[in-house]
């Protein structure tokens, strides 16, 4: 390589580049450095991609875009602080005497270093979006933030249409001018300004750098406003909802932020770039050097070519943008990826029946009247699987699916969850744990691994908690081994006897009905209805209670619903839940109230599934804004998202039991959403579909 073309984005930077080129040339540093003038970082990235330039220093956000969209790689990193190397930490600071946590930021007053700045804006906003705390409709991040906080100071937001809320806490200069300016004229600008906004009580939380509080407290050389401040009077907000002392930033932060880095095309030799810059920094990074690589004072600007706070440049070992940025920062960036110019005009929803088409049409009209974005379009399909195919092909955008279909959508079609359904706390028909219940009996104690030849009670053939999950789990764990995919026979041979009520049996193994008792007259044995006294979840528990079976597979609430006076029927009126136990997957037994730790699986709620290229935050942002208007079944806005009775049907578009659409948070894949135990059980059952 004879020459190296550096891309600049302003006249002062072009001038500094030319000076650096001369300095390098004068020192005999090879290859020679040329300066290519671009108009912006985006323009420079395009020039590098088109081989019209070779290198530029970018911040984390730009490294992300350049890497993701153009395949550029980081090769040389800046170091600002010898202690923490090529990174720093974005933190959220609160006053110690407040009770704010990361989970209670809604409605709180916020202080930011400046609009679009890494630590003060990109990381906290991206983090809040990515974790589902903050929903963004139609890529309008400014509006979303303005609505989320109870007033903010975001210097630089004055030129936006949301300045009222985003500049509400800003003060300007001593004479009250330049309010919300993205410059030192705004007293709450930059790291120290954002902290001052918190310290003076204007805001309740400040988004700053890990070192900001320590640099502005405890009597160090400080501006007058900070003299009396003590670092111990402030705390950090941690991602898990806890708080920590200011010195705990390594473990309690929003994200580790990567330093700026020099990026080049993937086919370029990163080592060559570092050798060139390293020779340069050895000669030109001292205060008495004829040219100073890490200073921009001579050009009346800041951070030209490199950040002025750079102490040295170091080679990057793993030269890909993801490794350099790190998971925390990547997650935050994901939340900010929304580009209003790329927002699709429509979100095409998959519908599967005439009533669903009607409800979807009404939803589209209702959303449109309220100017919700993107607009809904309804597209018919023949089956959930057909929806999945159409979404994979890019012809449809979204569909709500149940557990088994979520698995198929993810595994076979690569779809991902964008939002989920939340059911009422007390609604156990939709959200529950699957448990194996036994009588408390010290003389006849067995574990989950010792179920062979025991007597089993099930609510009915195909019931999720009573059949699909426990049997699937036993198959997947190798206890039940069906021959020729004959699950029924395999189960009948595994247990000594069972009661598994069934409708319209054919070739049904008798031992699966052996424990069933029928009605009071002994008729209707094993039928899949209440005529069989051991049918359903309460019936399966009764089968255990009356000593017909040794184990019952139930929902975690079943025992409570039928004990301690909750069920007045003669068979249940005297029962105490304390007389029953749960069998745990680890071989232990537990009290029945320990269901969260001792269960076979948690039944996953339904999820809205989309193509992996679809921006999930846009989908959730739309649904979240919509449910504020249409989520309550008794709302007066002309449409009920979570009710289908008007269409003489049920569970159209969403389950009627839904109380809210919720963000996926960290459950960004179908496996995360379903949970490992449910997946194990499902794979056990699916392995037997010959």
């Amino acid at each position: 390589v004879m020459e190296m073309q550096w891309c600049t984005i302003s006249d002062p930077e072009q001038q500094k580049c030319k000076d650096m080129s001369k300095a390098f040339q004068g020192a005999g540093i090879q290859p020679s450095l040329l300066c290519v003038q671009g108009t912006s970082t985006d323009h420079c990235v395009q020039l590098i991609k088109d081989q019209k330039a070779d290198a530029i220093t970018l911040d984390g956000g730009a490294i992300y875009q350049a890497g993701k969209e153009y395949g550029l790689k980081p090769v040389v990193g800046e170091v600002y602080d010898q202690d923490i190397g090529t990174s720093y930490y974005a933190v959220a600071v609160v006053r110690r005497n407040s009770n704010v946590t990361i989970n209670t930021l809604k409605g709180v007053k916020s202080c930011h270093t400046g609009i679009n700045r890494t630590v003060g804006w990109n990381v906290p906003v991206g983090y809040l979006v990515e974790t589902g705390h903050l929903s963004v409709m139609g890529c309008d991040v400014l509006k979303a933030v303005g609505d989320y906080f109870g007033g903010s100071c975001v210097p630089g937001a004055g030129e936006t249409s949301h300045s009222e809320s985003l500049c509400r806490l800003c003060r300007g200069d001593s004479s009250g001018h330049n309010v919300c300016d993205k410059s030192p004229l705004e007293r709450y600008y930059d790291y120290s300004g954002a902290f001052r906004c918190l310290a003076e009580g204007a805001g309740d939380v400040a988004f700053v750098k890990h070192s900001t509080v320590l640099e502005n407290t405890d009597g160090k050389t400080l501006p007058s406003w900070g003299k009396a401040l003590m670092s111990q009077d402030f705390q950090l907000l941690c991602r898990d909802g806890s708080r920590a002392d200011i010195t705990e930033w390594r473990r309690c932060h929003l994200a580790k932020v990567p330093a700026h880095a020099v990026v080049v095309r993937d086919d370029m030799d990163g080592g060559l770039i570092f050798r060139l810059l390293n020779e340069g920094q050895l000669l030109f990074s001292h205060e008495d050097s004829s040219f100073q690589m890490f200073s921009s004072k001579a050009y009346g600007q800041k951070n030209l070519l490199f950040k002025d706070s750079t102490l040295e440049l170091v080679p990057i070992a793993t030269q890909n943008y993801e490794s350099w940025l790190g998971q925390e920062y990547l997650h935050a960036m994901k939340g900010l990826l929304c580009d209003p110019n790329r927002l699709p005009h429509y979100l095409r929803w998959c519908v599967l029946s005439v009533p669903e088409i009607q409800k979807c049409g009404d939803m589209a009209v209702a959303f449109s009247r309220q100017s919700l974005k993107p607009e809904i379009q309804c597209v018919s399909a023949e089956s959930p699987e057909h929806c999945m195919q159409q979404i994979q092909a890019g012809h449809i955008d979204a569909v709500t699916l149940r557990g088994e279909d979520i698995y198929r959508a993810g595994k076979a079609y690569g779809l991902v969850p964008a939002a989920g359904e939340l059911y009422a706390e007390e609604d156990r028909s939709n959200s529950y744990f699957v448990v194996a219940v036994v009588r408390r009996d010290s003389s006849y104690s067995f574990t989950l691994d010792e179920l062979r030849s025991k007597r089993s009670c099930h609510p009915g053939l195909g019931s999720p908690a009573g059949w699909e999950v426990p049997i699937g789990s036993l198959i997947q764990r190798g206890f039940i081994r069906p021959k020729d995919c004959d699950v029924l026979t395999a189960v009948s041979e595994f247990f000594n006897a069972s009661c598994v009520p069934v409708n319209n049996p054919k070739n049904y193994p008798s031992s699966l009905c052996a424990l069933c008792v029928g009605d009071e007259k002994g008729r209707n044995k094993c039928v899949g209805s209440s005529q069989e006294r051991y049918y359903g979840y309460s019936g399966a528990f009764r089968c255990l209670v009356e000593n017909a079976g040794d184990v019952a597979f139930l929902k975690h609430t079943t025992v409570f619903e039928n004990t301690n006076g909750h069920n007045p029927e003669p068979w249940a009126s005297h029962l105490r839940w304390q007389d029953y136990e749960l069998l745990c997957p680890n071989g232990a037994r537990a009290e029945v109230d320990q269901f969260q730790a001792c269960n076979l699986a948690q039944m996953p709620s339904h999820a809205v599934m989309v193509h992996p290229d679809t921006n999930i935050f846009t989908v959730y942002g739309l649904l979240d804004k919509a449910q504020d208007l249409f989520g309550d079944d008794h709302n007066k806005n002309g449409f009920q998202m979570f009710d289908s009775s008007k269409y003489h049907s049920q569970d159209l578009l969403f389950k009627d039991a839904t109380v809210r659409a919720v963000p996926v948070r960290e459950k960004t894949t179908y496996l995360d959403w379903l949970g490992p135990d449910y997946v194990v059980a499902l794979e056990g059952m699916l392995s037997q579909q010959c």
Epitope: A497, N507, S511
Partner: antibody
């Protein structure tokens, strides 16, 4: 009406093999298991095994697993039982029987008489 | 394998009489017991399953009872056409096994 029409009587020599057929009609052939049962004066009724016409999966009584082989031909709705290495003890009436709601014989064919004689 | 025992090889009765045929299993079969009758020159026909459930079309003079290991088929009023061999069978566990049969004779 469920009908199971079995093949006619067989007279075979010891050591030979025989194939008995059972043609089903009056229902969907692949919906129900087909069982085979041996009736002899010595041991009354003995269950030989069953076949699932849908996929050909079989289950045998251990004492017959080297004696009998069960197959089906879905296209003709016919089940077959091959009996090998015949001896006089195999002389009996052999029934095919269709399963019902539960997995055991409900409806029986008319039977096929097998005589094994030198 | 589960052994089903019908202790009476023959039972003699008159038309109009009530008769009970018994069957004992070598272990608890959880009421998974079927009864068949086989008339001379015919194939067996299912009468009862689950110890007491009558098969479609079976006259109500046939009733079954029992639990655990002991089972009974009762004909409340014997008819001439009931002359047959009666077999019990357990349908709890494969291999399905049959009793040796009880021959009902009309006096």
């Amino acid at each position: 009406e469920v009908q199971l029409q079995q093949s006619g009587p067989e007279l075979v020599k010891p050591g030979a093999s025989v194939k008995i057929s059972c043609k089903a009609s009056g229902y969907s052939f692949t919906d129900y298991y087909l069982h085979w049962v041996k009736q002899s004066h010595v041991k009354s009724l003995e269950w030989i095994g069953r076949i699932n016409p849908y996929n050909g999966a079989t289950s045998y009584n251990q004492i017959f697993k080297d004696k009998a082989s069960l197959t089906v031909d879905k296209s003709s709705s016919t089940a077959y039982m091959d009996l090998h290495s015949l001896t006089s003890e195999d002389s009996a009436v052999y029934y095919c029987a269709r399963g019902g709601d539960y997995d055991f014989p409900w409806y029986w064919g008319q039977g096929t008489t097998l005589t094994v004689s030198p | 394998d589960i052994v089903m025992t019908q202790s009476h090889k023959f039972m003699s009765t008159s038309v109009g009489d009530r008769v009970s045929i018994t069957c004992k299993a070598s272990q608890d079969v959880y009421a998974a017991v079927a009864w068949y009758h086989q008339k001379p020159g015919q194939s067996p026909k299912l009468l009862i399953y689950w110890a007491s459930t009558r098969h479609a079309g079976v006259p109500d003079r046939f009733t079954g009872s029992g639990s655990g290991t002991d089972y009974t088929l009762t004909i409340s009023s014997v008819q001439a056409e009931d002359l047959a061999l009666y077999y019990c069978q357990q349908h709890y566990r494969t291999p399905w096994t049959f009793g040796g049969g009880t021959k009902l004779e009309i006096k």
